[in-house]
């Protein structure tokens, strides 16, 4: 017996072929001996089978001796034998039928999990194989999952069904919420400007849902909300924002906030968070401010960052076109009765600098 | 072709009101950002308020908030700017203007109407 | 709100001149910035939008760029129907905010 493997939804062909290329009287029955349909002379003609409404066949191929059995939308249900009754002989085709469909909707957040479900006639013993767009193969049964998607999770799944030494293959659509990194840090000399962006990893025709950005100021005991907004088909509207600092937020995507200046004050960290209507569940993405200040007062150069920074950050204060005078890892260094010049203040990561600031030193009379 | 016509403009006294209205043809009007703008006589252009396409949000001046109210009619294509409370400085003419799709800028924009406040 | 300052507030120039004006945003705005030409009667009309994007139709001598919160508006050759008033407008967020004009006229 010949088998034959459907998806739900989709439309099957069922070939019969007869020994004559020319039209003859054929009939395509299922297991329960229901004819479906068959032809009269030229016509086409249909049983009370439950498939009547979704069967057909192709009358251009008759002539040719070839009897097709096509099914359109195909159901779970439609799993069964069918039998095409061609000049007194029998053929068998056995159409198993599966549906893979993702339990939940297909947009999920970054962290969550995915579930498959594989939908299957009776009596059939189905393995399911599916590769994920970054190159992770999953195997199971009826249901498969995935744990903590992550961004690179987002994308076309390709799931194999194997099923007597036969397979049909799934492709699920699969878009992960999130940012586009999980975390950021920018690096101002204070007074400077300071942007926040936020891009989204996804695009959706319309966006909706509340967003607001706590602020954890190093210099602070506590955290604070700067911003709460909302998001209405991709539009930003602020809904409440502190007086301190005196911040903006753009209208419209990628969200995108602005500081007027940068101040030791504001450096620390933030979490911007962003909850999707229909989800549960929010985005994140952290922001860290460094600010960066030098100073001289009186004999005493000084060089201070404030914010998050790594322990192998180096600060370092150099006179123009010369040697360090003074590298540490530390957030402070000064440098006692400095020569007249321009001085460099340099923050820097294994030789790369991340911040710099010049002051002036002038010559003492 | 998408075109904007505004009208209600006229001579009123300080402190009295006036309905600007501004019919859109050739566009669906709830996908769009609206704004007013105006331009004092000599002067230069000065946004009023705004309305996001969905109406639900609405954005005005300082120099204008507490006094003037935008709304919008999706089932007219009309844009308003009800004024209230006028004031000699309010006298101006009032462009409507709308945004694009995916940008913010006023792509097209209609011919004005004037708005005298005088006793 | 956010400020912005544009200069020069006028501007004397001849047919065939490169011109620029320029505009500075009190704060960080990305580039949610529009150039805007006026002239006498009539309704602004948009050439530049997102600080640098050409609006269809408007001949391509107009060019925008920006620098930071610093954006410029430059005619690389005035042609006689150039003269006339130039805005930009800061479109990054609610309250929007004109430039406070370059006018632009014929030495």
């Known amino acids: 017996k010949k088998v034959v493997l459907g998806k739900k939804g989709d439309t099957v062909e069922l070939t019969c072929t007869a020994s004559q290329k020319k039209s003859i009287q054929f009939h395509w029955k299922n297991s329960n001996q229901i004819k479906i349909l068959g032809n009269q002379g030229s016509f086409l003609t249909k049983g009370p089978s439950k498939l009547n409404d979704r069967a057909d066949s192709r009358r251009s191929l008759w002539d040719q001796g070839n009897f097709p059995l096509i099914i359109k939308n195909l159901k779970i249900e439609d799993s069964d034998t069918y039998i095409c009754e061609v000049e007194d002989q029998k053929e068998e085709v056995q159409l198993l039928v599966f549906g893979l469909t993702a339990n939940s909707d297909t947009h999920l957040l970054q962290g969550q999990s995915l579930t498959l479900t594989l939908e299957s006639p009776p009596g059939s013993s189905p393995s399911v194989q599916c590769r994920s767009p970054r190159g992770k193969n999953i195997q199971g049964g009826k249901t498969l999952s995935v744990s903590q998607l992550e961004l690179q999770d987002s994308g076309t799944w390709t799931c194999t069904v194997l099923q007597n030494q036969k397979k049909v293959e799934f492709k699920i659509d699969i878009v992960v919420l999130a940012f586009q990194k999980a975390s950021s840090i920018v690096y101002k000399k204070e007074g400077e400007q300071v942007e926040f962006s936020f891009p989204l990893a996804f695009t959706v025709e319309k966006l909706t849902g509340s967003g607001e950005l706590w602020w954890q100021a190093e210099r602070a005991s506590s955290s604070k909300s700067w911003i709460t907004f909302d998001l209405k088909n991709k539009e930003v509207s602020v809904k409440r924002v502190t007086q301190d600092p005196k911040l903006q937020m753009g209208k419209k995507l990628p969200l995108h906030l602005t500081l007027p200046q940068a101040l030791p004050q504001y450096a620390g960290s933030g979490n911007l968070t962003l909850a999707l209507e229909a989800k549960t569940g929010k985005l994140h993405q952290e922001v860290n401010l460094v600010v960066m200040r030098a100073t001289q007062l009186q004999k005493n150069l000084t060089c201070e960052v404030w914010g998050p920074t790594s322990p192998k950050l180096m600060l370092s204060l150099k006179l123009e076109n010369k040697e360090a005078k003074v590298s540490k890892r530390e957030k402070a260094v000064w440098v006692l009765n400095p020569e007249a010049g321009m001085w460099q203040c340099l923050l820097s990561d294994s030789g790369q600098v991340l911040l710099e600031s010049n002051i002036k030193v002038l010559p003492t009379w | 072709e998408v075109e904007l016509l505004e009208s209600g403009g006229g001579l009123v006294q300080p402190g009295g009101s006036l309905r600007l209205s501004c019919a859109a043809s050739g566009l669906t009007f709830s996908t769009f950002a609206m704004s007013w703008v105006r331009q004092a006589p000599g002067k230069g252009l000065e946004w009023v308020s705004g309305i996001s396409g969905s109406g639900e949000n609405t954005y005005y001046a300082d120099s204008v908030k507490g006094r003037f109210t935008i709304t919008s009619d999706n089932s007219k294509n009309t844009l308003y700017l009800q004024m209230n409370s006028l004031r000699a400085e309010d006298t101006a003419v009032y462009y409507c203007?709308?945004?694009?799709?995916?940008?913010?800028?006023?792509?097209?924009w209609g011919k004005g109407t004037t708005v005298t406040v005088s006793s | 709100a956010i400020q912005m300052t544009q200069s020069p507030s006028s501007l004397s120039a001849s047919v065939g001149d490169r011109v620029t004006i320029t505009c500075r945003a009190s704060?960080?705005?990305?580039?949610?910035l529009g150039w805007y030409q006026q002239k006498p009667g009539k309704a602004p009309k948009v050439l530049i939008y997102?600080?640098?994007s050409l609006q269809s139709g408007v001949p391509s001598r107009f060019s925008g760029s920006r620098s930071g919160t610093d954006f410029t508006l430059t005619i690389s050759s005035l042609q006689p129907e150039d003269f006339a008033t130039y805005y930009c407008l800061q479109d990054y967020t609610y309250p929007y905010t004109f430039g406070q004009g370059t006018k632009l006229e014929i030495k």
């Open positions: 997102e600080a640098s």
């Open positions: 203007a709308k945004e694009g799709y995916n940008w913010n800028y006023m792509d097209v």
């Open positions: 704060h960080g705005i990305r580039n949610d």
